[in-house]
């Protein structure tokens, strides 16, 4: 008997062959013997099974000897052994017919986890095996799950299906909420504009929620929000802002936040959460600002960073188009005595420069000007 | 809901080949015969031919000897091929999916052939 | 190949008449003919199957009928989107023909 393997909400085709490559009478049933379609003449005639509003034929293949039967929306109810009655001849085709869908909502927060449940029919053992956008693999029996989205596994999963040595293959659009960048850093001048942005890693039609901006200076010694807002088919409300710093936000996505001046006391960590409408948990992105200020005091040259800088990074005082003078793992560094000219003071990782700010040093008898 | 949509070379010189292809989109692949249909200028609708998902096609004899149809079951797409054509090729050409009437239709190309 | 005849080859009505047009085959086609309404830049559209069916979302307005080799279009009550050329199809034997239109203009 010939397997066939449907899945649910398909259309398939059973084919069934004449030896006479001529239109000649032919019955559909179903294992109950009770008919689905044939033919009468030139006229297609269908009995009382309950595929009747699901079932057609191709009358322009009847001239060619072969008399197909095709189920539309396929249910998981319709897999059973069907029966064509042509030449007095039976040809058997076994129909299974498998769903495959996801627990919750194909939109799943990142680090939640999906689940792949089977649908199959009485008596059937079928395997599966699913593919994630990134190539990892996954099997298993009625169901499957995948712990800690990442959101690298955005994107169409594919599952096979295998039964009778046949295979079904299903394809789901698994769509991770979250920001495009887990964390980031932002190194400002003292007095600078400062932007933040914070890109969603996701596009959809509608998009409302609400979200907050936690902030951990380094100075204070507790955080403090700095910002809440309204998200509502994609378009931006601040709720409440705080008046220092007065922060700025725009009205579309992505997310953009503006502070108007990078100062010392602003410089650290904050994190931004989105808790996006009929989704239990929120997206995270943690946003770092480091600020630099470099002054002279009499006799003192200074350079110093405020904020999360790592222990890599390295400072440097230098006069310009000369060596360093002083070069520091530190967060502060200083010249006594500077000789007259433009010194630039450096905020480098492994040779990269991250910022940069620049001071005149004149000669003895002025006062200093910053460029 | 299902929906066709197409794309090919719009401008081509006599004896060149025409090449078109039609993506499915949100529904059945399988099950159903994915068609070719050309409209000259102020003609009538003229059938080219067809396609199932495990390649087995029916065409028009009139056009069979320039006509072929394949498929690429992975991508959910079909694709025509007509060659050596003529300015009687000229014409808007649909896709569009059966069983027995075309429902639904791609959007349709206007392919000119001049020399 | 089954040829396909519509008449008349373009009909002018006005908004609220009723519209009949026919189509006829070369030989028996049982009821495996359907009716389609085309519009200038856009794809034609399945109005009626199997002969009589109408297809889901296509108003009331519109009825098939016939069998054999006599096929008719009905519009009960045109509507100012009615007007568009309309084609019928045999799926009775390869290859697929249409009739040759029946363009319904505003009178």
């Known amino acids: 008997k010939k397997v066939v393997l449907g899945k649910k909400g398909d259309t398939v085709e059973l084919t069934c062959t004449a030896s006479q490559k001529k239109s000649i009478q032919f019955h559909w049933k179903n294992s109950n013997q009770i008919k689905i379609l044939g033919n009468q003449g030139s006229f297609l005639t269908k009995g009382p099974s309950k595929l009747n509003d699901r079932a057609d034929s191709r009358r322009s293949l009847w001239d060619q000897g072969n008399f197909p039967l095709i189920i539309k929306n396929l249910k998981i109810e319709d897999s059973d052994t069907y029966i064509c009655e042509v030449e007095d001849q039976k040809e058997e085709v076994q129909l299974l017919v498998f769903g495959l869908t996801a627990n919750s909502d194909t939109h799943l927060l990142q680090g939640q986890s999906l689940t792949l449940t089977l649908e199959s029919p009485p008596g059937s053992s079928p395997s599966v095996q699913c593919r994630s956008p990134r190539g990892k693999n996954i099997q298993g029996g009625k169901t499957l799950s995948v712990s800690q989205l990442e959101l690298q596994d955005s994107g169409t999963w594919t599952c096979t299906v295998l039964q009778n040595q046949k295979k079904v293959e299903f394809k789901i659009d698994i769509v991770v909420l979250a920001f495009q960048k887990a964390s980031s850093i932002v190194y400002k001048k003292e007095g600078e504009q400062v932007e933040f942005s914070f890109p969603l890693a996701f596009t959809v039609e509608k998009l409302t929620g609400s979200g907050e901006l936690w902030w951990q200076a380094e100075r204070a010694s507790s955080s403090k929000s700095w910002i809440t807002f309204d998200l509502k088919n994609k378009e931006v409300s601040v709720k409440r802002v705080t008046q220092d710093p007065k922060l700025q936000m725009g009205k579309k996505l992505p997310l953009h936040l503006t502070l108007p001046q990078a100062l010392p006391q602003y410089a650290g960590s904050g994190n931004l959460t989105l808790a996006l409408e009929a989704k239990t948990g929120k997206l995270h992105q943690e946003v770092n600002l480091v600020v630099m200020r470099a002054t002279q005091l009499q006799k003192n040259l200074t350079c110093e960073v405020w904020g999360p800088t790592s222990p890599k990074l390295m400072l440097s005082l230098k006069l310009e188009n000369k060596e360093a003078k002083v070069s520091k793992r530190e967060k502060a560094v200083w010249v006594l005595n500077p000789e007259a000219g433009m010194w630039q003071c450096l905020l480098s990782d492994s040779g990269q420069v991250l910022l940069e700010s620049n001071i005149k040093v004149l000669p003895t008898w002025s006062t200093p000007v910053q460029p | 809901q299902v929906q066709l949509q197409q794309w090919g070379a719009g401008l081509l010189k006599p004896s060149e080949t025409l090449s078109l292809t039609c993506a499915v989109y949100g529904g059945s692949f399988s099950g159903y015969y994915w068609s070719w249909i050309r409209q000259p200028p102020g003609k009538g609708l003229e059938w080219i031919g067809e396609i199932n998902h495990s390649g087995s096609t029916n065409y028009n004899p009139s056009l069979k000897s320039r006509v072929t149809i394949s498929v690429d079951t992975s991508k959910n797409q079909f694709s025509l091929k007509l060659s050596s054509v003529t300015a009687a090729d000229t014409a808007v050409y649909y896709c569009?999916?059966?069983?027995?009437?075309?429902?639904?239709w791609g959007q349709g190309t206007l392919v000119t052939v001049s020399s | 190949d089954i040829q396909m005849t519509q008449s008349p080859s373009s009909v002018s009505a006005s908004v609220g008449d009723r519209v009949t047009i026919t189509c006829r085959a070369s030989q028996d086609i049982s009821s495996w003919l359907a009716w389609y309404q085309h519009k200038p830049g856009k794809a034609p559209k399945l109005l009626i199957y199997a002969a009589s069916s109408l297809q889901s979302g296509v108003p009331s307005r519109f009825s098939g009928s016939g069998s054999g080799t006599d096929f008719t279009l009905t519009i009960s009550s045109l509507q100012p989107e009615d007007f568009a050329t309309y084609y019928c199809?045999?799926?009775?034997?390869?290859?697929?023909?249409f009739g040759q239109g029946t363009k319904l203009e505003i009178k």
């Open positions: 199809q045999q799926a009775n034997s390869f290859p697929y023909t």
């Open positions: 569009a999916r059966v069983i027995n009437w075309f429902d639904p």
